[in-house]
Interface confidence: low
Amino acid sequence: MALFSAQSPYINPIIPFTGPIQGGLQEGLQVTLQGTTKSFAQRFVVNFQNSFNGNDIAFHFNPRFEEGGYVVCNTKQNGQWGPEERKMQMPFQKGMPFELCFLVQRSEFKVMVNKKFFVQYQHRVPYHLVDTIAVSGCLKLSFITFQNSAAPVQHVFSTLQFSQPVQFPRTPKGRKQKTQNFRPAHQAPMAQTTIHMVHSTPGQMFSTPGIPPVVYPTPAYTIPFYTPIPNGLYPSKSIMISGNVLPDATRFHINLRCGGDIAFHLNPRFNENAVVRNTQINNSWGQEERSLLGRMPFSRGQSFSVWIICEGHCFKVAVNGQHMCEYYHRLKNLQDINTLEVAGDIQLTHVQT
């Protein structure tokens, strides 16, 4: 079966992890998780769900090492669990690497563990409603990949790719490329997205026994990076930035600019172990905001993905799929916020405005 990359992989995601599945689930999509269970593992969970709140889970896959080991499969609709389906086998071993593969088919999910068929789970809700994957529990993940079948053969990790055709920039500071990044049939359509892609150079990411090497993209962005935000911001518009923090990083920043003003300044500072947020109007900075819901989500030498969603009253920021903070608008003319700037001690791999 020919496979091609449906979206860029999540590399070394921090557990618990929640991240979007771009374009949602569609028939033929193969989602592969490679990682290692912890030696003291009791259970872990992979959820294919609608949005980040966890109230609607189309497929809950839950290996449990207790009672001799078994796997629970279930569906949650509107916060209510359905009847469990239990497979009284345990294909995972504590402390050992694994490859877990979910293949979306018309009537069911097929689950493979270490390249062997393990279980199938009949769809109880339409799979196209799924737009998010969530992983939690006693495991460490190396990556999550998304591959579509029945498409031209391409090396999955040779480039960062999307399921729609993408042209790669000819120059280091890529011209923006437009692509239709949409959900499958039967679901509300998605907006047109500007995706700034990066050519990649093969390079081994890790060499954990039992886990094949993964090619990781070498970025080709010029820092600082500037790009227009077509038509400015509006509620529910989102921006996604991913990259790698340099090993000796001090700080970097993401600015959403409104002319000469900075409507939103997001500034991770590694020497202060803080993420500073602020607004600059007429060259004057306002009051800094530093509070975080959890720990500092950025780490030196680590990859990251930042989603900034513009709401009517605030920006919401998620890092590596986890909600980090809200920042109430100080500049209210959202449609005039029309430039993204990224600078500092990082390499950029992907920008979507």
């Epitope: 979007p20 109230n55 239709q180 990044n181 907006a191 047109q192 038509n231 529910s236 009517g312 998620a318």
Partner: antibody, heavy 124, light 107 residues
Framework: EVQLVESGGGLVQPGGSLRLSCAAS????????IHWVRQAPGKGLEWVAL????????QYADSVKGRFTISADTSKNTAYLQMNSLRAEDTAVYYC?????????????????WGQGTLVTVSS | DIQMTQSPSSLSASVGDRVTITCRAS??????VAWYQQKPGKAPKLLIY???SLYSGVPSRFSGSRSGTDFTLTISSLQPEDFATYYC?????????FGQGTKVEIK
């Protein structure tokens, strides 16, 4: 099954008020942008207003600004259009429709589900 | 506000004909344009979103395209059930607007 059902239409005199309701079911109401669109008899579609309830964000067409107020009650999965100072030219079938969005995905650039419409007649 | 100028306002065609309807935006709206079909006494139905993406359940004879600020809806081979009024709508600004509509009638 996704459903939007409008109600509250009727005959009202010029200068009067009316409140339309749009009851939603089959989806997570708070995650969606709701629009009101109207259509005068024999005329085309005219966009009226929108609300993104979880962000408290509203927008209005210039023709209704200051007279109409859009609101939503997420506990009731219902959007409202309060129409004051009604004029003859507000006579139309009023539709509510949804535009989906799920954090942190993007604004969905189409109205994929519509109600059946409710007729508002402004006449003396 | 962004104006969407739709043309023609009406057209007569026969079953099997290729039909093209255009909308021109008064300024850039990116690809944020949708097309709808409406039949008398009914709510509009979504056909195309993001300028060129076919909505689920919509026959493949419908297609959309974009060239700058010009947007086109094409029906490759008109069927009896396609006689209706078609509207474009832009979402490229915070105030969405519709085109005036194109009525497709039987010749």
């Amino acid at each position: 099954e996704v459903q939007l059902v409008e109600s509250g239409g009727g005959l009202v005199q010029p200068g009067g008020s009316l409140r339309l309701s749009c009851a939603a079911s089959g989806f997570t109401f708070s995650s969606y942008v709701i629009h009101w669109v109207r259509q005068a008899p024999g005329k085309g579609l005219e966009w009226v207003a929108l609300i993104y309830s979880s962000g408290g964000y509203t927008q209005y067409a210039d023709s209704v600004k200051g007279r109409f107020t859009i609101s939503a009650d997420t506990s009731k999965n219902t959007a409202y259009l309060q129409m004051n100072s009604l004029r003859a030219e507000d006579t139309a079938v009023y539709y509510c429709a949804r535009v989906g969005t799920t954090y942190p995905s993007r604004y969905l650039e189409a109205l994929d589900y519509w109600g059946q419409g409710t007729l508002v007649t402004v006449s003396s | 506000d962004i104006q969407m100028t739709q043309s023609p306002s009406s057209l007569s065609a026969s079953v099997g004909d290729r039909v093209t309807i255009t909308c021109r935006a008064s300024q850039s709206v990116s690809s944020a344009v949708a097309w709808y079909q409406q039949k008398p006494g009914k709510a509009p139905k979504l056909l195309i979103y993001s300028a060129s993406s076919l909505y689920s359940g919509v026959p493949s004879r419908f297609s959309g395209s974009r060239s700058g600020t010009d947007f086109t809806l094409t029906i490759s081979s008109l069927q009896p059930e396609d006689f209706a009024t078609y509207y474009c709508q832009q979402f490229g600004s915070s105030l969405p607007t519709f085109g005036q509509g194109t009525k497709v009638e039987i010749k």
